[in-house]
């Protein structure tokens, strides 16, 4: 990636890291308003299976692993990217390495959910306070989950699907920060590990993933009022280990693995028409990216 200053533009979709033949250090940003990609400062260490989030205008890369010809190292790292300076800086590491992690943000705090360290599949969850640069464990999930999708709705943290080390999961659970407790919610219609999970219009969407046999293109959403999961239009491509984010009322899914190919495809879902469209391609195919959108 280039080391010059990033252009000071509005909301961009950032994609960090990923995997193609080995873990990647790319940081790239897509501008949906003009369809362009920016090549930004590389991660200091390549990683796949990471998660991305934005707090206070800064992009955070959380967990993952560095799978390279030299070896394979799960990551406990938290790194912070400043779009104004186009530079990465390390923050306090998590208590344990977490590959194929999920993250969510509540009240400016980053929650790191599940993930794996070697063959250990975590149910533990920890919270990062950027002002103090500190991590603290909170209540563990009821289920061990890697490849877990995480989303925040109404200041509640949802952990959806994943893999417990034996089975891929359709179960989901919700964390209540005030009570510091997890409760199961209605299970999805479909087993999904490595799905893309996000929130749009008061619903939690789960897109794609892997059911233990095949990659999926199906998409379902959870209505917190009715506590039910309903299918919406499927994506054009089957994909697991995809990136997902929401930008201006639309869902974007980035890359992933379809069982044969590392996808460069980026699809966009319009909830008004219940349709998916191909909007762009990443500069190269990859799975296991961390994705987030900058604030205004």
């Amino acid at each position: 990636g280039s080391m010059g200053h990033a252009p000071k533009v509005g909301r961009l979709i950032y994609t960090a890291g990923g995997y193609f033949r080995q873990s990647l250090s790319y940081l790239e940003a897509y501008n949906p308003s003009d369809g362009t990609w920016l090549d930004l400062a590389d991660l200091q260490v390549p990683r796949s299976g990471l998660a991305g989030c934005v707090v206070g205008g800064l992009l955070y890369a959380v967990g993952g692993r560095n799978n390279s010809p030299d070896g394979n190292t799960d990551s406990s790292a938290l790194d912070c990217y400043n779009p104004m300076t186009n530079q990465w800086s390390p923050c306090a590491p998590m208590s344990v390495p977490r590959n194929r992690i999920g993250v969510g943000v509540i009240d400016g705090h980053i929650y790191a959910v599940g993930g794996s360290h070697g063959c250990i599949h975590h149910n533990s969850v920890e919270r990062y306070e950027p002002e103090r640069d500190e991590w603290h464990l909170v209540a563990p999930m009821l289920t061990r989950r890697i490849g877990v999708g995480v989303a925040v709705l109404n200041r509640l943290l949802y952990a959806v699907g994943g893999f417990d080390g034996t089975n891929r999961l359709n179960s989901a659970e919700c964390y209540y920060p005030e009570r510091n407790e997890w409760r199961m919610i209605t299970a999805m219609n479909t087993i999904r590990s490595g799905a893309g999970v996000c929130v749009l219009h008061n619903c939690i969407y789960a897109a794609g993933g892997y059911d233990g046999q095949d990659q999926l293109n199906s998409v379902e959403r959870y209505d917190v009022e009715t506590e039910t999961w309903t299918f919406v239009a499927p994506m054009k491509h089957r994909r697991s280990a995809l990136g997902i984010t929401v930008h201006q009322g639309r869902i974007y899914v980035l890359g992933g693995y379809d069982g044969h190919t590392f996808l460069d495809s980026v699809e966009c879902y319009d909830p008004d028409t219940d349709t998916w469209s191909e909007v762009t391609r990443m500069t190269s195919g990859r799975s296991g990216v961390g994705v987030a959108v900058t604030m205004e």
Epitope: Y19, R21, S48, G49, N67, G71, N72, R100, G118, C119, I120, G147, F163, G165, T166, S193, G194, Y210, G212, Q213, D214, Q215, S240, A241, Y257, G259, F262, S287, G288
Partner: antibody
Framework: EVQLVESGGGLVQPGGSLRLSCAAS????????IHWVRQAPGKGLEWVAS????????LYAKSVAGRFTISADTSKNTAYLQMNSLRAEDTAVYYC???????????WGQGTLVTVSS | DIQMTQSPSSLSASVGDRVTITCRAS??????VAWYQQKPGKAPKLLIY???SLYSGVPSRFSGSRSGTDFTLTISSLQPEDFATYYC?????????FGQGTKVEIK
Amino acid sequence: EVQLVESGGGLVQPGGSLRLSCAASGFAISASSIHWVRQAPGKGLEWVASIDPETGETLYAKSVAGRFTISADTSKNTAYLQMNSLRAEDTAVYYCSRGQYGDATDYWGQGTLVTVSS
Amino acid sequence: DIQMTQSPSSLSASVGDRVTITCRASQSVSSAVAWYQQKPGKAPKLLIYSASSLYSGVPSRFSGSRSGTDFTLTISSLQPEDFATYYCQQSYSFPSTFGQGTKVEIK
């Protein structure tokens, strides 16, 4: 019945290449990790490579990294091990196996012998 | 890399004997240890996974246990078909590694 059948072994000169195949039946290779393990004549077992069906990520032993490539074709239900820049110390019986139970491997093929010699 | 030190490298026993084979991991591998049986010219067969879980179809005379970083395969009453080489394997940490094998021979 679950079966794995390796093929593609043989005699090759140092520096040469071979592509091993592992044809699976009785299960879908998209549903399990696939591993290659080798055994030099009269020696023990050595894990070589694996592929994850969910993420597509591959892992390699340091002794083969950069020279060997594991892949899978789910339409043919077959896994492959492409071996380049072969060395005498790569001489072994190569087994493919199915990862289950935290990557303990529950089914193995019969093995295919690779001999690297001039 | 994690070393799996297997002992003994060989042993002689009689039908009906109780046989114990040990693997010591050079660092913690949790319970991510499997045991395999291999006969000459054949592929290995899974006996035990997750340190102590008996694989489907394996006779109950085989058992596995863990004490810290020490792992044990026990054959409670050796049968003629049990004369073979036995390997332990850890899959806790990359790369997966095997013990060097224990050959069980007829006394």
